[in-house]
């Protein structure tokens, strides 16, 4: 049994998350994950799910009763989702920590928007000429 | 020229994001995107970046001066990042809108944690037996 299982069961007790009523009104994550089979689509969704759990764990980090469980699960996420790659985890954390209400952050984000957009689709990696054919060819003339 | 470019320039004016000082203290997103070449890694990062922009746009949705620009850019993101797939966009939006402080959401999230964790690594897709060899076979006895 993977080590996170025991610790997740401990969290379930702490949050009363084993009660039958928890399943009411569908799932948060599981149905969404079932919808997406492609690895890149899954990563888009899992990225949001992992950031949710990290925020949740942060809110309870000082509670001694679940500290060990939280630490074990976070370590497991780092091995499985981030491939034990601290640089990947650090970059991810930076992105999740930007404040959308900070005017300096807003200005930077808008300043970078054109370049971010240019890289959004996988096609962006196959060279400018090919990409422009892909998109321009699919767009009505302006 | 892609349609978002003109609208992003309009946003730059609105946010004074063309000023030279905006580039101080490094980039928010661009340096991070440069670090990641693998498509699945890029999606992990872009997922957070796109959710940041969506939050930013939400905060300014009632400002008439930039409404058209914001809508054009959002449409372009939907084409490029979500492949014009409304279900993908809807699932993404659901994930970004969950409140981490809502106790019902917390309970559901903890209830689903074991299954979410089981699917986190790409290895999870190659069948339970093979995956257990990858991780369990490489773990010391507890």
């Amino acid at each position: 049994q993977d080590p996170y299982v025991k610790e997740a069961e401990n969290l379930k007790k702490y949050f009363n998350a084993g009660d039958p009523d928890v399943a009411d009104n569908g799932t948060l994550f599981l149905d969404i994950l079932r919808n997406w089979k492609e690895e890149s689509d899954r990563k888009i969704m899992q990225s949001q799910i992992v950031s949710f759990y990290f925020k949740l764990f942060k809110n309870f980090k000082d509670d001694q009763r679940i500290q060990k469980s939280v630490e074990t699960i976070k370590e497991d996420i780092n091995v499985k989702f981030f491939n034990s790659n601290k640089k990947k985890r650090d970059d991810f954390e930076k992105l999740t920590n930007y404040s959308v209400t900070d005017s300096n952050v807003q200005r930077k984000a808008v300043h970078e928007l054109i370049q971010v957009m240019a890289e959004l689709s996988p096609a962006a990696k196959i060279g400018k000429r090919k990409r422009s054919q892909m998109f321009r060819g699919r767009r009505a003339s302006q | 020229q892609d349609p978002y470019v003109k609208e992003a320039e309009n946003l730059k004016k609105y946010f004074n994001a063309g000023d030279p000082d905006v580039a101080d203290n490094g980039t928010l997103f661009l340096d991070i995107l440069r670090n990641w070449k693998e498509e699945s890694d890029r999606k992990i990062m872009q997922s957070q970046i796109v959710s940041f922009y969506f939050k930013l746009f939400k905060n300014f949705k009632d400002d008439q001066r930039i409404q058209k620009s914001v809508e054009t850019i959002k449409e372009d993101i939907n084409v490029k990042f979500f492949n014009s797939n409304k279900k993908k966009r809807d699932d993404f939006e659901k994930l970004t809108n969950y409140s981490v402080t809502d106790s019902n959401v917390q309970r559901k999230a903890v209830h689903e944690l074991i299954q979410v964790m089981a699917e986190l690594s790409p290895a999870a897709k190659i069948g339970k037996r093979k995956r257990s060899q990858m991780f369990r076979g490489r773990r010391a006895s507890q």
């Epitope: 993977d2 080590p3 996170y4 060990k68 939280v70 630490e71 074990t72 976070k74 370590e75 497991d76 780092n78 091995v79 491939n83 034990s84 790659n85 601290k86 640089k87 990947k88 985890r89 650090d90 954390e93 | 440069r34 670090n35 990641w36 070449k37 693998e38 890694d41 991780f135 490489r138 773990r139 010391a140 507890q142």
Partner: antibody, heavy 124, light 111 residues
Framework: EVQLVESGGGLVKPGDSLTVSCVAS????????IHWVRQAPGKGLEWVAT????????FYSDSLRGRFTVSRDNAANSVYLHMSSLRGEDTALYYC?????????????????WGRGTLVTVSS | NFMLTQPLSVSGYPGKTIVISCVRS????????VQWFQQRPGSAPAMVIY?????PSGIPDRFSGSVDASSNSASLTISGLKTEDEADYFC??????????FGGGTKLTVL
């Protein structure tokens, strides 16, 4: 003060097995990955294996997987490297090195703290 | 096969600046942190740079690290060279899931 102390090295014959140990102190042991790194006389550094903190996942150098097994006892603040079917080229100083705390995004640097090493000599 | 390639030896005069390169053979150097270690004869390696460009406490600012994605390499720069800097220097990074990789080492001689 962070300390890592290796022991259990010695002279063994080719084909024999040996387990070297590392006892750690000065930090919350169970939170940290631990690496084994070796250095043959007059040669460079070679990574051998890593074991994660609470989850105890094991990672091995491709060239050594199958012959070497890493394990840990968090209650005893100890990590072990079991080496079997030893060969002359396994002769080296074996270092125990502290890795990241992967449960903490502000973890101290990986491979910052090294033990002094324990010498394993494989010879007939 | 993943490799980190360093020059076998580098030399410089006291007070001068030397650069040791570390070229990654495959995969992106920017996708994993790079560390640098100094090893004097008879001692365990000691970290001089971690996470690309950071110095552990006690390491003087004469030591600096950088990563260049265009050449897929990392560099250790030592300025104001001192005789005590004479040692072997190893770069280190990662591949796969927590697979640790060391460069072959560079012998620094202070002339």
């Amino acid at each position: 003060e962070v300390q890592l102390v290796e022991s259990g090295g010695g002279l063994v014959k080719p084909g024999d097995s040996l387990t070297v140990s590392c006892v750690a102190s000065g930090f919350t042991f169970s939170n940290y990955f631990i690496h084994w790194v070796r250095q043959a006389p007059g040669k460079g550094l070679e990574w051998v294996a890593t074991i994660s903190g609470r989850t105890k996942y094991m990672f091995y150098s491709d060239s050594l997987r199958g012959r070497f097994t890493v394990s840990r006892d968090n209650a005893a603040n100890s990590v072990y490297l079991h080496m079997s079917s030893l060969r002359g080229e396994d002769t080296a100083l074996y270092y125990c090195v502290r890795g990241y705390d992967h449960s903490d995004s502000n973890s101290a640097a990986d491979l910052l703290h090294w033990g002094r090493g324990t010498l394993v000599t494989v010879s007939s | 096969n993943f490799m980190l390639t360093q020059p076998l030896s580098v030399s410089g005069y006291p007070g001068k600046t030397i650069v040791i390169s570390c070229v990654r053979s495959s995969g992106s150097v920017a996708s994993h942190y790079v560390q640098w270690f100094q090893q004097r004869p008879g001692s365990a390696p000691a970290m001089v740079i971690y996470e690309d460009s950071h110095r552990p406490s006690g390491i003087p600012d004469r030591f600096s690290g950088s990563v260049d994605a265009s050449s897929n390499s990392a560099s250790l720069t030592i300025s104001g060279l001192k005789t005590e800097d004479e040692a072997d220097y190893f770069c280190q990074s990662y591949y796969g899931n927590n697979q640790v990789l060391f460069g072959g080492g560079t012998k620094l001689t202070v002339l």
